[in-house]
C-alpha cells in the first residue's frame, strides 16, 4: 500500500515562528505497507547533518525531525518525504526564527477558541502565551448592565475574572463550571509585559439543555516551543 498520513492534525500548523535558542520539532506521522522511509529536505535540497551547527535528530519511530537551539540561519522550508515502493508523499513546514529581543507578548493564533456547551456544562478557554519578559495575564468578560454593553462614557462593561500572578500555574486556563445562559458571551485573554500588551478573545455559546453542543470545542494543543514560556525572562 502507498504511504499515507496517519495524523494530519499534527501537521496542520505549517508556519512555525520560533524564538531563537528554542527547540523545534516537525512531525509527519505516516503509514504504508511496506513501512515507508522518511527523509528531510531543506529548501528543496537534501538536509544533511553538517548543514547546521549541532546537527539535528530524526526519530523515525515518531516520524519527527528535531532541531535544538535554533538560530536565524535555520529559517526556511522543511519538507518530509515519505516513500515506499508504491509511492511517495511529502509535506512542507516553514520555519521562521525570531531573534530574542524584548517584545510585547505573542499569543498563539486561534486561542482562546470559541466554545459551546449546554446549560450546566463545563468549559475551558486556553490562552497560549510567549513572552521573554514576565507576562501578566488577565481573563476578562464582556458583560451587560441594565441591558447595555456600554456605559454612558462609551466604554464597554468589562468584568475581570482572573489575574495571573508571577508564578501562577493555571493563569492560561479559564475554567467555567455549571454554566448558565448568563455565562454566554465574549471572553478576552489579555497579556501584558513591560514592553506592551496583546489580547485575543473567544465566544462562549450556551445551548439549552436538550440541545447537544456542536463540534466547536476549545483547542488545547500547543506547539512544542511554547511549552516552557514561563521560564523565558
Amino acid at each position: 500500500r502507498a504511504p499515507y498520513w496517519t495524523n494530519t492534525e499534527k501537521m496542520e500548523k505549517r508556519l512555525h515562528a520560533v524564538p531563537a535558542a528554542n527547540t523545534v520539532k516537525f512531525r509527519c506521522p505516516a503509514g504504508g505497507n511496506p513501512m515507508p522511509t522518511m527523509r528531510w529536505l531543506k529548501n528543496g535540497k537534501e538536509f544533511k547533518q553538517e548543514h547546521r551547527i549541532g546537527g539535528y535528530k530524526v526519530r523515525n519511530q515518531h516520524w519527527s525531525l528535531i532541531m535544538e537551539s535554533v538560530v536565524p540561519s535555520d529559517k526556511g522550508n522543511y519538507t518530509c518525504v515519505v516513500e515506499n515502493e508504491y509511492g511517495s508523499i511529502n509535506h512542507t513546514y516553514h520555519l521562521d526564527v525570531v531573534e530574542r529581543s524584548p517584545h510585547r507578548p505573542i499569543l498563539q493564533a486561534g486561542l482562546p477558541a470559541n466554545a459551546s456547551t449546554v446549560v450546566g456544562g463545563d468549559v475551558e478557554f486556553v490562552c497560549k502565551v510567549y513572552s521573554d519578559a514576565q507576562p501578566h495575564i488577565q481573563w476578562i468578560k464582556h458583560v451587560e448592565k441594565n441591558g447595555s454593553k456600554y456605559g454612558p462614557d462609551g466604554l464597554p462593561y468589562l468584568k475581570v475574572l482572573k489575574h495571573s500572578g508571577i508564578n501562577s500555574s493555571n493563569a492560561e486556563v479559564l475554567a467555567l463550571f455549571n454554566v448558565t445562559e448568563a455565562d454566554a458571551g465574549e471572553y478576552i485573554c489579555k497579556v501584558s509585559n513591560y514592553i506592551g500588551q496583546a489580547n485575543q478573545s473567544a465566544w462562549l455559546t450556551v445551548l439549552p439543555k436538550q440541545q447537544a453542543p456542536g463540534r466547536e470545542k476549545e483547542i488545547t494543543a500547543s506547539p512544542d516551543y511554547l511549552e516552557h514560556h514561563h521560564h523565558h525572562h
Epitope: H136, Q138, I140, K141, D153, L155, P156, L158, K159, V160, L161, K162, H163, S164, G165, I166, S168, N170, A171, L174, A175, L176, F177, N178, V179, D183, K190
Partner: antibody
C-alpha cells in the same frame, strides 16, 4: 445577603502554624467569577493582601509570603482556609477575609469583621 | 509590585468643608479605558468598606458626598461636604496588576 466571618486561634506561639477559617453565606464559591481573598492588618497599620482563591480552585499568593501561605476552600461547606507556617511576632494582626466584587476579582466588596491573632515569642 | 502613595497621611477638615485625598500609583493602572483604582473607608474596630470602585463609581449605599476621579496613575477621593460620620482612615487600592496593593492610608479627622 452576603456575610463572611473569620475564626482563628486568637493566640499562638512563634514557629507554630496559624490556621484561619472564613465561613460565608449569601454566595457560592462554585459560581464562575467568584473569589475570596485574605487580607491582614497589624494594629494601627495598613492593609496587606495575602492570598486569593478562585471558583476553579486557582490560587494567588503575596510573593513575599508565598512559601509560608496555603489557601484552600471547601465549596460544599462555604468555607475558605488560610494556613501560615512558622509564624513570628510580625504576623500579629487582624486577619480579614473578603469576597471579590461583581466587577473585579481583586476588588474587595464584602468583608468579614476580622479575627485578631497574637503571636507570642 | 505597584506602589500606591497616598497623601496626606492625615487630614483635619472642618465640618461641612471639602476633604481631598490623593493616591499616586508607581505605574498606570488603566486598561481598556478603565482605571482599576478603588477607595475604602475604615473606622476603628471595623473592617474596611468599599466606597468607590474603578476610580469614579459609587458603591451601592454610599452617600453621594463621596466621589472619585483620576486616571492612569493619579487619583483623588473627594468628600464634600464632610460629616461627623466620615471620621475614618481611607485607603486606595489597585486591582489592575497582581498582586493587589493598598496605599498606606489617610487619617481624616475633624478640625
Amino acid at each position: 445577603q452576603v456575610t463572611l466571618k473569620e475564626s482563628g486561634p486568637g493566640i499562638l506561639q512563634s514557629s507554630q502554624t496559624l490556621s484561619l477559617t472564613c465561613s460565608f453565606s449569601g454566595f457560592s464559591l462554585s459560581t464562575s467569577g467568584m473569589g475570596v481573598s485574605w487580607i491582614r492588618q497589624p494594629s494601627g497599620k495598613g492593609l496587606e493582601w495575602l492570598a486569593h482563591i478562585y471558583w476553579d480552585d486557582d490560587k494567588r499568593y503575596n510573593s513575599s509570603l508565598k512559601s509560608r501561605l496555603t489557601i484552600s476552600k471547601d465549596t460544599s461547606r462555604n468555607q475558605v482556609f488560610l494556613k501560615i507556617t512558622s509564624v513570628d511576632t510580625a504576623d500579629t494582626a487582624t486577619y480579614y477575609c473578603a469576597r471579590s466584587s461583581d466587577w473585579d476579582d481583586y476588588t474587595m466588596a464584602y468583608w468579614g469583621q476580622g479575627t485578631s491573632v497574637t503571636v507570642s515569642s | 509590585d505597584i506602589v500606591l502613595t497616598q497623601s496626606p497621611a492625615s487630614l483635619a477638615v472642618s465640618l461641612g468643608q471639602r476633604a481631598t485625598i490623593s493616591c499616586r500609583a508607581s505605574e498606570s493602572i488603566d486598561d481598556f479605558g478603565i482605571s482599576f483604582m478603588h477607595w475604602y473607608q475604615q473606622k476603628p474596630g471595623q473592617p474596611p468598606k468599599l466606597l468607590i470602585y474603578r476610580a469614579s463609581n459609587l458603591e451601592s449605599g454610599i452617600p453621594a458626598r463621596f466621589s472619585g476621579s483620576g486616571s492612569r496613575a493619579d487619583f483623588t477621593l473627594t468628600i464634600n461636604p464632610v460629616e461627623t460620620d466620615d471620621v475614618a482612615t481611607y485607603y486606595c487600592q489597585q486591582s489592575n496588576k497582581d498582586p493587589p496593593t493598598f496605599g498606606a492610608g489617610t487619617n481624616l479627622e475633624l478640625k
